[in-house]
């Protein structure tokens, strides 16, 4: 009897994981085995597929063989027992085009209300990604273990954390890689748990914001309890963006060392032009908090992105608002050629609720204010331009009293 | 492979300093932490200190600060830990070792063992 | 500075037991904890690291686990070769400090 060909061959690329299957033509027929050949492009002669020679199970593997990537292959397949079968020709592919991207490794660490991830890709040194190795990005999904509801996180990096999470609760996430530049979404890792920490004695601190005051920078946070010491910490940001990369070299702030303060001031020349990430730590002497989230520090915008100034002219029931330019050392306003959109927080001296407002205008009214009361406002710059979304710090809070109740305007 | 390997054994006076080196192979220690851990006969491991030799930023025990000093070559790919005004209770074997912020100490160098007696 | 105590100096177990080595941190350092083995004349070798991952070559009859303050080495069906002292270390604050070390005795 003849032997049929095999039919349906499936070539799966997972990293440098190379697997054929394919389906026997013929069940009837027992004690086959199976032998592929392979071609390059540009060549005339078939080679043996080391790996996928006499298999009698319906699955082989040539991750051994030693091809180039981005060269086009063609395979071969025949039944053999005592005689063969003719050969059926595989259409041919690009291994590194029919490559999917395997789930990374991923590593976890836990604190009372964050998690660290690290990941890394699932085959170290892998010939497949090897002129891509370093623009692999990282896409998750976590949940709590008790709710399911999930939530992602896109555009991730090697190493990544996750604040504001519930102390003692069990977390899980599953992570994948995509290269960008090549169109490529991998496979999701598998689930990984962990349960976050008793909460920590000690909060971290909380409200990071930098301003410029003459040739300084005014590092500011807040913080719960009094009597504490802090400790600043900056990384070049780009830092987060190399895969190999683990060990971050968290540097110290000379002038932001042991601060009994919830502030700190320390030159401009302290960092070159650049993209600065910043934490604080706490410490009572005896226990020490965890850090604080990470704020992004831009030199450039910082430098140039000051609180707005603005006068206040109080009526019975709202305050007219004139935003004028920011005022740098020596009284001099600053020229600020490029478009801004103020954020205005107001609120009743006696009362924690805020309203805002959002205005392009330098003239703003705030309404339906009461008569004989004092209200405090503050504000704030942001530009408009999508690519350089910054905002300035809040202003210092200006209070003012509303006229009695029988003002004109 | 990945290796630390520590100069020899030292022998020195009370009072005098001793200078302990440490050297990587297998990989560049610009890209990590070296750490140094004291050891004395019989008892626990005590964390002495650390550099950064990219930069030379150094991080010290506070029972070690002002006596010991670390101090990289990266030219040699060496990191050295000098301890100066010895006594007896600096008797101890000084291990050096690897910190990469994601497997902790993963390689050790084979311990450097200083005896100090008059 | 964290203090690490491993209460218990010495532990007696006998081949095929199951052994479990704890150790207390004086706050919370999260999971950033490491355990070693240290044989005599030998530089310690590190075991388990963030609290509960092996480092590669290491059996898996070795596991680590816990969170915050509270941490535990356990060795299943315990070997001859485990014979040795067993530290801990918080790396989650300067100074990095280890516990005072378990040394695993066999009966």
């Known amino acids: 009897k003849n032997l049929k060909s095999p039919q349906k061959v499936e070539v799966d690329i997972i990293d440098d994981n190379f697997i054929l299957r394919w389906n026997r033509s013929d069940e009837s027929v027992g004690n086959v085995t199976f032998s592929f050949d392979y071609q390059k492009t540009g060549m005339d002669n078939w080679i043996k597929l080391s790996g996928c020679q006499n298999i009698t199970s319906t699955k082989c593997n040539f991750s051994s063989l030693k091809l180039n990537v981005y060269e086009e292959i063609k395979l071969r397949i025949r039944a053999e027992k005592e005689n063969t079968s003719s050969w059926y020709e595989v259409d041919s592919f690009t291994p590194f085009r029919k490559a999917q991207i395997g789930p990374p490794e991923v590593h976890l660490e836990a604190e009372d209300k964050a998690i660290v991830i690290h990941i890394s890709p699932g085959t170290k040194d892998s010939v497949m990604w090897a002129l891509d190795g370093l623009s692999f990005t990282y896409s998750l999904v976590i949940w709590k273990n008790s709710s399911g509801v999930e939530e992602r996180i896109e555009n991730i990096y090697s190493r990544h954390k996750i604040y504001k999470l519930s102390p003692e609760t069990t977390y899980c996430l599953k992570v994948k890689a995509a290269l960008l530049t090549s169109w490529k979404i991998g496979v999701y890792s598998p689930v990984h748990c962990i349960k976050t920490t008793v909460e920590n004695e000690l909060p971290p601190p909380e409200n990071i914001e930098v301003s410029v005051q003459n040739q300084n920078y005014v590092l500011k946070w807040d913080y719960t309890y009094a009597n504490m010491t802090f400790q600043v910490q900056w990384l070049h940001a780009f830092l987060k963006r190399n895969p190999g990369n683990h060990l971050y070299k968290w540097k110290q702030i000379p002038d932001c060392e042991n601060v009994k303060t919830t502030q700190c001031v320390f030159p401009q020349n302290v960092f070159q032009k650049g993209i600065y990430l910043l934490r604080v730590q706490a410490s009572d002497g005896n226990n020490t908090s965890f850090w604080s989230e990470e704020i992004k520090f831009d030199t450039e915008i910082q430098a140039f992105l000051l609180p707005p100034v603005f006068n206040i002219r109080s009526l019975s029931d709202s305050f007219h608002i004139y935003i004028g330019a920011p005022k740098q050392s020596g009284n001099t306003p600053v020229i600020q050629d490029y478009p801004l959109i103020y954020e205005i927080i107001f609120w009743e001296n006696t009362s924690n609720a805020e309203r805002k407002i959002i205005e392009k205008k330098t003239d703003v009214t705030v309404p339906n204010l009461k008569p004989l009361t004092v209200y405090c406002v503050k504000a704030r710059a942001h530009t408009m331009d999508e690519k350089l979304n910054k905002s300035s710090v809040f202003s210092d809070a200006v209070c003012e009293k509303t006229k009695p109740g029988n003002t004109s305007k | 492979e990945v290796q630390l390997q520590q100069s020899g054994a030292e022998l020195v006076k009370p009072g005098a300093s001793v200078k302990v080196s440490c050297t990587g192979s297998?990989?560049?220690?610009?890209?990590?932490?070296i750490h140094w851990v004291k050891q004395r006969t019989e008892q626990g491991l005590e964390w002495i200190g650390r550099?950064?030799?990219?930069?030379?930023?150094?991080k010290y025990a506070p029972k070690f600060q002002g006596r010991a000093t670390i101090t990289s070559d990266t030219s040699s790919n060496t990191a050295y830990l000098q301890l100066s005004s010895l006594t007896s209770g600096d008797t101890a074997v000084y291990y050096c070792?690897?910190?990469?912020?994601?497997?902790?100490?993963?390689?050790w160098g084979q311990g450097t063992t200083l005896t100090v007696s008059s | 500075d964290i203090v690490m105590t491993q209460s218990q100096k010495f532990m007696s177990t006998s081949v095929g037991d199951r052994v479990s080595v704890t150790c207390k941190a004086s706050q919370n350092v999260g999971t950033n904890v490491a355990w070693y083995q240290q044989k005599p004349g030998q530089s310690p070798k590190p075991l388990i690291y963030s609290t509960s991952y092996r480092y590669s070559g290491v059996p898996d009859r070795f596991t680590g686990s816990g969170s915050g303050t509270d941490f535990t080495l356990t060795i299943s069906n315990v070997q001859s070769a485990d014979l040795a002292a067993y530290f801990c270390?918080?790396?989650?604050?300067?100074?990095?400090?280890f516990g005072g070390g378990t040394r695993l005795e066999i009966k």
């Open positions: 550099i950064d030799p990219e930069d030379g930023e150094t």
């Open positions: 270390q918080q790396y989650n604050n300067y100074p990095y400090t």
């Open positions: 297998g990989f560049n220690i610009k890209d990590y932490y």
């Open positions: 070792a690897r910190y990469d912020g994601y497997y902790c100490f993963d390689y």
